[in-house]
Amino acid sequence: CEEPPTFEAMELIGKPKPYYEIGERVDYKCKKGYFYIPPLATHTICDRNHTWLPVSDDACYRETCPYIRDPLNGQAVPANGTYEFGYQMHFICNEGYYLIGEEILYCELKGSVAIWSGKPPICEKVLCTPPPKIKNGKHTFSEVEVFEYLDAVTYSCDPAPGPDPFSLIGESTIYCGDNSVWSRAAPECKVVKCRFPVVENGKQISGFGKKFYYKATVMFECDKGFYLDGSDTIVCDSNSTWDPPVPKCLKVLPPSSTKPPALSHSVSTSSTTKSPASSASGPRPTYKPPVSNYPGYPKPEEGILDSLD
């Protein structure tokens, strides 16, 4: 027989020879870091077929690291489900707790003994410091000094000294989250007031109000013979500007060769950026109709809008 087989877990006792005679036996021992558990054989014989009789290293078991219990409020999860050397132990904490120490320990061989690469971590309760104070506002539980996981606070704005109220910009409620960090930035309290939206040759049809504060929503329609350039719905944003900008109502010109068609009220097209106050001054561009299949409107090929007048 030629050289005997090699194994991961066991090694030949003595030096291997280039050739072995029929009937000759070789013995193995468990390698460093492995230990023998009977009764499986750890030897083989060169048989008359000039092959070695079957043998395996299943009798040699890896050294295992000491058992680690789950940390309080967490879990120790052995990778591959084993404590044997060469493998890892992963640690995770329950919701509301965070890890102090190493997230992964390695089962390592020191001499012939398997030991863990470090101390098991611990799981500490997630705690948050008080959330930020905000100008012109306050939050609930302002007297509490330590907040636990998922504890929530809600912000509100103070009464304003002037005629216009403070608006709360952002989410009013935040909670103590993972890593002892609040779930989002604190909101802000400020006066948000949009200007009165003026549309020439059109008018407001909903969202009427004395003043237009944060998130006020207004809708418009154009007079007969005019179409809406921009969005028919605008919202007062946190910068005290209308978003999208206040639209304009532009004149629809009838086809030059026919009498003017009957016109429906207004047609909304995609939003475009315009000045907040509709302006009748400045250059007057040529406009093409933005729509084609609305009742009473000329199709683009039937006539063009060459003026605002």
């Epitope: 008018k203 407001q204 009427f208 302006s279 001054s281």
Partner: antibody, heavy 118, light 107 residues
Framework: QVQLQESGPGLVKPSETLSLTCTVS????????ISWIRQPPGKGLEWIGV???????NYNSAFMSRVTISVDTSKNQFSLKLSSVTAADTAVYYC????????????WGQGTLVTVSS | DIQMTQSPSSLSASVGDRVTITCRAS??????LNWYQQKPGKAPKLLIY???SLHSGVPSRFSGSGSGTDFTLTISSLQPEDFATYYC?????????FGGGTKLEIK
């Protein structure tokens, strides 16, 4: 307290251009929206137009082809120009501040009488 | 344009009277209506904006109401300084238009 003061010639000949200024004291013209309003003798009020802080203007269509409202920030003044005047344009002309971007007129000048006559 | 019609065009009343002036719009204007007071030889003064909101410094005897097309200005107890001409003004639609005025005279 912001004050508005209209000024200009009290007499304008027919077909000429009426030019008035509105001087702002106690504030900057760049932060005010200003309207011009007129009142013929013994009659009611008539809105002429407005100029907004962004420079945009809106005019009463009754005057559209002959009115211009502008601002001169260096002089802290607004101006009204009305061309091709007739006797029907004889009136007291007021400039009035649009309140905080909303179309109510909270602060008015004292008004200036313009007579159109040859 | 939206026409604003005031009634009556003139009215005689005594000090202490309760007075109501009406203003009618030719189409719905929501609450977009203001009231002004004008004394002879003077510029108008804003009394009420957005139908019922009192402008700063205006006495509480003045009040406004209405919605849509019909509006009223009420003076609960007339004072000597209240004798003047009153104008309504709409601002839902350009051009912003005024009523013809109501002249309030001493009886």
């Amino acid at each position: 307290q912001v004050q508005l003061q209209e000024s200009g010639p009290g007499l304008v000949k027919p077909s000429e251009t009426l030019s008035l200024t509105c001087t702002v004291s106690g504030g900057s013209v760049s932060s005010y929206d200003i309207s011009w309003i007129r009142q013929p003798p013994g009659k009611g009020l008539e809105w002429i137009g407005v100029i907004w802080t962004d420079g945009g203007t809106n005019y009463n269509s009754a005057f559209m082809s002959r009115v211009t409202i502008s601002v001169d920030t260096s002089k802290n003044q607004f101006s009204l120009k009305l061309s091709s005047v007739t006797a029907a344009d004889t009136a007291v002309y007021y400039c009035a501040r649009v309140y905080d971007g909303y179309p109510w007129f909270a602060y008015w000048g004292q008004g200036t009488l313009v007579t159109v006559s040859s | 344009d939206i026409q604003m019609t005031q009634s009556p065009s003139s009215l005689s009343a005594s000090v202490g009277d309760r007075v109501t002036i009406t203003c009618r719009a030719s189409q719905g204007i929501s609450n977009y209506l203001n009231w002004y007071q004008q004394k002879p030889g003077k510029a108008p003064k804003l009394l009420i904006y957005y139908t019922s909101s009192l402008h700063s410094g205006v006495p509480s005897r003045f009040s406004g109401s209405g919605s849509g097309t019909d509006f009223t200005l009420t003076i609960s107890s007339l004072q000597p300084e209240d004798f003047a001409t009153y104008y309504c003004q709409q601002y839902i639609k350009l051009p912003w238009t005024f009523g013809g005025g109501t002249k309030l005279e001493i009886k």
